[in-house]
């Protein structure tokens, strides 16, 4: 079997260890006898058999340390894990998630009070007591709060006509309150009577365009923790009640609002004061804030827009969408069902991703089934425990900084596991921690450039021109991202990631992200392009390789030769083609146009004798077989049968 340790010509201890978890480096002074290259790097057993003493071998091992003292978590254990990794190695540990029997519940109603919601808001007057009784079996400690939203109070979202600016719904013959971005009306309270009074006092408002400013309001409700009164220990439910879609980031450019949403709380006297100066949040930003603040969202949607919200669910973890009946009759049922579903689902997400560290998480559900961690387990009861098998891998050793941490967070839980990553990338012989030994293979040293003395080497800079470090004479040295050493670029180490290439022109942080992970966590970034691990493909490694087979038509062609396969779906590159396999292209067949008269001859049914005669004379030389496949489509194509 190939021994990559010995065959890769590793010139230094660090390079050797980076080759793979099986490689070791011998620091013994008198180890190299014949001067053959890279004898110091080999499999540990080989080094020993070649005469290297065990205590002279640099071979950092993988450690998983789980401190048992000071464990404060009750639902997610262990709360902290320390992992020592070396290149190519992986470490394993088990994470337990144990839902509590009963959680306090904070339920905040965020209600679209635009005019079309008139009937639904009336129902809110009576939800409190009924809901508290229905939720009593799930939680003893139940609080309700309330806030209202409409949209950004600028044109073209609201009417700025003087007669309508204060009453947007004169069309409905209603006396409306002025439009607003978001108003926090009632902080979370266990006093149901107070909640019902606040809802009873709520007046309808209005605006012009169909989408509302729901995501603006949601973000504020999520991040303004002290205003809303969210409790640390509670399950936090944000019920968004609406009958329309929501504006997304960039929509507000239409009103000249171009400052990106900063994701912070901007409530002054319970009113969102940045509504008219800051953009709507993006879905990614909203998702991040909801997860960070342990908010589970229930979209309670009436009417046709229910599916718009349902389609968002994969992008907003810990979110549920339910359809409300007319006058919101089933609103409480929706809350109870959603809560029952939320507390019976346990899934995790990796946050604070560490550059170059890869997590593979498998949930082991109470029924014994195994699921990917992001999918997690369903039908989990409070007596159950969900186990997550976590595998942490470090592919390479090219990231600066020795110690880092990631966070594994069960969605909707207020506890996390902090995973400290220690990269064993350097050798003891390099930093005087251990006995002084050979950290560089002397057979590699270029005497013209390296001047070595007692295992310390320095460079003789003057002998080399910096021109060899430029991709073009007009370009900066090493693309401005490195220094020229011995005529070669040594690229800067930066926090964003790795800069590399002959002229430091490449990097590994400008690749596309998918669900917050670089290359979806299924590949490595090289020169701005995702290089996918085996079994994954797509521009961001987001697609399982098997997905490609869904793009092959009955003739074995990928997307009929008119498109590319993206995650098992054809994206037609020819704008004229449509269909699952881009198979329909009414205007593609120039062969049909050019030879239309002769095409008839291939399907001679119901042709007059005159035309049949013409077929024999004018079209006799036509290579009919060549067109058969295409013509069958010509004749089935509506555009040719008109």
């Amino acid at each position: 079997e190939d021994n990559r340790c010995a065959s890769s010509n590793a010139a230094s201890c660090a390079r050797c260890l980076a080759l793979g978890p099986e490689c070791g480096w011998c620091v013994q002074e008198d180890f190299i006898s014949g001067g053959s290259r890279s004898e110091r790097c080999d499999i540990v057993s080989n080094l020993i058999s070649k005469g290297c003493s065990v205590d002279s071998i640099e071979y950092p091992s993988v450690h998983v340390i789980i401190p048992t003292e000071n464990e404060i978590n009750t639902q997610v254990t262990p709360g902290e894990v320390s992992i020592q990794l070396r290149p190519g190695a992986e470490a394993n540990f088990m994470l337990k998630v144990h839902p509590l029997k009963k959680y306090p519940v904070d339920l905040y109603y965020l209600v679209d009070v635009s005019a079309s919601m008139h009937n639904n808001i009336e129902k809110l007057n009576s939800v409190g007591n009924d809901l508290s009784r229905k939720m009593a079996f799930f939680s003893r400690d139940f609080r309700l709060g309330f806030g209202s939203y409409v949209d950004k109070t600028v044109s073209p979202y609201i009417s700025i006509h003087p007669e309508r600016i204060h009453n947007q719904c004169s069309d409905y013959n209603l006396d409306c309150m002025p439009p607003h971005g978001y108003i926090h009306v009632l902080s979370l309270t266990e006093n149901i009577t107070e909640f019902e009074k606040a809802v009873h006092r709520q007046k309808i408002s209005g605006n012009i365009d169909t989408p509302e400013g729901g995501f603006d309001a949601m973000l504020q409700a999520a991040v303004c923790e002290s205003h809303i009164g969210w409790r640390k220990e509670a399950k936090r439910l944000l019920l968004v009640m609406t009958d329309q879609t929501s504006h997304l980031a960039l929509d507000s450019k239409l009103a000249g609002i171009v400052v990106p949403n900063d994701g912070n709380c901007h409530l002054k006297n319970n009113v969102y004061v940045k509504s008219t100066t800051m953009e709507h949040p993006s879905l990614g930003q909203l998702s991040e804030k909801l997860i960070d603040n342990n908010i589970n969202v229930i979209f309670a949607v009436q009417g046709k827009q229910f599916h718009w919200y349902k389609d968002l669910l994969p992008l907003l973890p810990g979110t549920i969408a339910g359809e409300i009946e007319s006058k919101a009759a089933n609103l409480n049922n929706l809350v109870v069902e959603a809560y029952q579903k939320l507390i019976s689902e346990v899934k995790v997400q990796v946050e604070n991703q560490v550059q170059g560290i890869y997590f593979n998480i498998t949930a082991i559900c109470p029924d014994g089934s195994r699921k990917p961690g992001m999918e997690g387990c369903r039908n989990v009861t409070s007596n159950d425990e969900v186990l997550f098998n976590v595998t942490v891998t470090m592919k390479k050793c090219d990231v600066t900084g020795g110690k880092n941490y990631a966070i594994i967070k069960p969605i909707g839980f207020n506890e996390t596991a902090k995973i400290h990553i220690h990269r064993n990338c350097s050798c003891q012989c390099e930093d005087n921690r251990g006995p002084k030994g050979k950290c560089v293979d002397e057979t590699f040293l270029d005497s013209k450039c390296f001047q070595c003395d007692e295992n310390k080497c320095h460079f003789d800079e003057d002998q080399f021109s910096s021109e060899s470090c430029k991709s073009h004479k007009d370009q900066p040295v090493c693309s401005g991202r490195g220094v020229c050493v011995c005529g070669k670029c040594s690229c800067h180490k930066i926090k964003l990631g790795k800069v590399y290439g002959k002229y430091c022109e490449k990097d590994d942080f400008s690749c596309p992200y998918h669900h917050g992970n670089l290359c979806a966590g299924h590949g490595e970034c090289e020169a701005g392009r995702c290089q996918c691990f085996s079994g994954w493909e797509g521009d961001r490694c987001q697609c399982p390789s098997a997905a490609a087979q869904h793009c092959v038509n009955s003739k074995g062609q990928v997307c009929s030769g008119r498109g590319t396969c993206v995650c098992g779906r054809c994206e037609c590159t020819d704008p004229r083609s449509i269909g699952r396999f881009c198979e329909h292209c009414p205007t593609c067949y120039t062969a049909c146009k050019e030879n239309w008269n002769c095409m008839q001859c291939l399907h001679p049914h119901n042709l007059s004798q005159a035309i049949l005669d013409q077929c024999k004379t004018s079209c006799a030389l036509m290579e009919q077989q060549h067109y058969v496949d295409q013509t069958s489509e010509c004749f089935s194509s509506p555009s040719y049968l008109r």
Partner: antibody
Framework: EVQLQQSGPELMKTGASVKISCKAT?????TYWIEWVKQRPGHGLEW???????????NYNEKFKGRATITADRPSNTSYMQLSSLTYGDSAVFYC????????WDHGTSVTVSS | DIEMTQSPSSLSASLGDRVTISCSTS??????LNWYQQKPDGTVTLLIY???NLHSGVPSRFSGSGSGTDYSLAISNLEPEDIATYYC?????????FGGGTKLEIK
């Protein structure tokens, strides 16, 4: 631990009123709904009504409306159920119970109505 | 009011048996259905809430299922202490209503 203690058995005349008490301990009295249920000998259970002491909200079964009055006295952590215009059909065991995930039913108060 | 129909009204089974009691409602109660056990001495305990959730401290031999208007309580591996009358109760709409009860006896 949730505990409820009801008042003792009652022997009443037809047309009179009876007031049964139910003292709660082991939890925050104002936050739990208290249910009242009637069971005639050899019969099933019949819901009379309930109250949430914290808000004063009370709901009744239409069948008992006007005759049953459910109240709660927060200082003494006690709920009361008064039933007026008693008839022979009111000879029954009356239960008070907490509502929710730590539901607890007391052993009941026996009321006998005679002439 | 929502009417609750329990069946059978009584049943006799042997120790170790599995028994099922049904409860039918006159309209959809959206799983807002509880099962109670009343022992011969009058003691009432909650067994199942929200149609299928086992109440704390109740043996796992008891299980509830159903949706819409049809619900059931199953007791597996019958034990002597299961001799009791079992009631279903809906709490979807006021007034809350109980089923007529099912008296379980041991053969």
């Amino acid at each position: 631990e949730v505990q409820l203690q009801q008042s003792g058995p009652e022997l009443m005349k037809t047309g009179a009123s009876v007031k049964i008490s139910c003292k709660a301990t082991g939890y925050t009295f104002s936050t739990y709904w208290i249910e009242w249920v009637k069971q005639r000998p050899g019969h099933g259970l019949e819901w009379i009504g309930h109250t949430l002491p914290g808000s004063g909200t009370t709901n009744y079964n239409e069948k008992f409306k006007g005759r049953a009055t459910i109240t709660a006295d927060r200082p003494s952590n006690t709920s009361y159920m008064q039933l007026s215009s008693l008839t022979y059909g009111d000879s029954a065991v009356f239960y008070c119970a907490t509502w929710g995930w730590d539901t607890y039913w007391d052993h009941g108060t026996s009321v006998t109505v005679s002439s | 009011d929502i009417e609750m129909t329990q069946s059978p009204s009584s049943l006799s089974a042997s120790l170790g048996d599995r028994v099922t009691i049904s409860c039918s409602t006159s309209q959809d109660v959206s799983s807002y259905l509880n099962w109670y056990q009343q022992k011969p001495d009058g003691t009432v305990t909650l067994l199942i809430y929200y149609a299928s959730n086992l109440h704390s401290g109740v043996p796992s031999r008891f299980s509830g299922s159903g949706s819409g208007t049809d619900y059931s309580l199953a007791i597996s591996n019958l034990e002597p202490e299961d001799i009791a009358t079992y009631y279903c109760q809906q709490y979807s709409n006021l007034p809350y209503t109980f089923g007529g009860g099912t008296k379980l006896e041991i053969k």
